[in-house]
Amino acid sequence: HNTTVFQGVAGQSLQVSCPYDSMKHWGRRKAWCRQLGEKGPCQRVVSTHNLWLLSFLRRWNGSTAITDDTLGGTLTITLRNLQPHDAGLYQCQSLHGSEADTLRKVLVEVLADPLDHRDAGDLWFPGESESFEDAHVEHSISRSLLEGEIPFPPTS
């Protein structure tokens, strides 16, 4: 699996999307987990509704929400009030019994809140926001890791 990078701004919301084949994963609950180290386990953060038919209902665990469009084949995770400690490697998973298929590997990067910069003339808002209010809409910037890039910094 390639790793997709999603960037969000500290204090704002970040939306991560994981597309999948809706027929291949028909009847499967989904989950969002955080990778603990390069070789470590993936620790479950939140999973979709216990009843697959109700997967469209948003479920929260703390500041993380998950919802699944099972017909369209898109799992959406929202990280609310993004903080620097939220940065790291995650996975979207499709669940069956004790098994979990990886749908997408995600690297979450947290950018400094531009409002922390005191010079208002240097403010940058994601997207093409025209007003101050628009700057706080949910957004994400995503890309795939380039070949050779590693999601975890080398340990000394």
């Epitope: 084949d21 027929m23 291949k24 028909w26 009847g27 019994g97 098994e99």
Partner: antibody, heavy 121, light 107 residues
Framework: EVQLVQSGAEVKKPGESLMISCKGS????????IGWVRQMPGKGLEWMGI????????RYSPSFQGQVTISADKSISTAYLQWSSLKASDTAMYFC??????????????WGQGTLVTVSS | EIVMTQSPATLSVSPGERATLSCRAS??????LAWFQQKPGQAPRLLIY???TRATGIPARFSVSGSGTEFTLTISSLQSEDFAFYYC?????????FGPGTKVDIK
């Protein structure tokens, strides 16, 4: 009618290669996993592996990993089971089966009629 | 991998009687268990999936109880067409594994 039709019986010598087939009809072949099951003479059923023809995602049971190759051609709705070098111990009946996924559980609901493979010198 | 055991290996029953077949898993398989019937020279036929859901066209005399590690398939009143081999299959952990089977024959 939803069905899986397998290729005919084969008699082979040890060391020879072989590919048997399983053709699906009456349903969207790309949207269901196809599993392969072995049954040696007078014995029970053994799960070999499974393939999703939509993207050729393939999983093998550890016992069969490296022993066989599972593939599919979605353009002709056919799954395959292949050996590069047969052994006498490969003599068995081989079944393909469709896995239907659902909210109440998974089901190998449609089975092929089986292909008898005999390997003998 | 999960090891499935079935008992008895052979069950001799008279037509019209009740047959009780057991399937045990070496660890919990939740409700991810199926039962199949196989007659000599034929492909297996799905009877039950999701531990207790009867497949299309399977008569009500076939029922399953249990979950986790212990499952029981009951055929309430054996008909002549029910004499066959019965296999359970767990699909909770990879790889899926079949039980060794129970032969139900005529007493």
């Amino acid at each position: 009618e939803v069905q899986l039709v397998q290729s005919g019986a084969e008699v082979k010598k040890p060391g020879e290669s072989l590919m048997i087939s399983c053709k699906g009809s009456g349903y969207s072949f790309t949207n269901y996993w196809i599993g392969w099951v072995r049954q040696m003479p007078g014995k029970g059923l053994e799960w070999m592996g499974i393939i999703y023809p939509g993207d050729s995602d393939t999983r093998y049971s550890p016992s069969f990993q490296g022993q066989v190759t599972i593939s599919a051609d979605k353009s002709i709705s056919t799954a395959y089971l292949q050996w590069s070098s047969l052994k006498a111990s490969d003599t068995a009946m081989y079944f393909c089966a469709r896995r239907r996924q659902g909210i109440w559980g998974d089901a190998l609901d449609i089975w092929g009629q089986g292909t008898l493979v005999t390997v003998s010198s | 991998e999960i090891v499935m055991t079935q008992s008895p290996a052979t069950l001799s029953v008279s037509p019209g009687e009740r047959a009780t077949l057991s399937c045990r898993a070496s660890q919990s398989v939740s409700s991810n268990l199926a039962w199949f019937q196989q007659k000599p020279g034929q492909a297996p036929r799905l009877l039950i999936y999701g531990a207790s859901t009867r497949a299309t066209g399977i008569p009500a005399r076939f029922s399953v109880s249990g979950s986790g590690t212990e499952f029981t398939l009951t055929i309430s009143s054996l008909q002549s067409e029910d004499f066959a081999f019965y296999y359970c299959l767990q699909d909770n952990n990879w790889p899926p594994t079949f039980g060794p089977g129970t032969k139900v024959d005529i007493k």
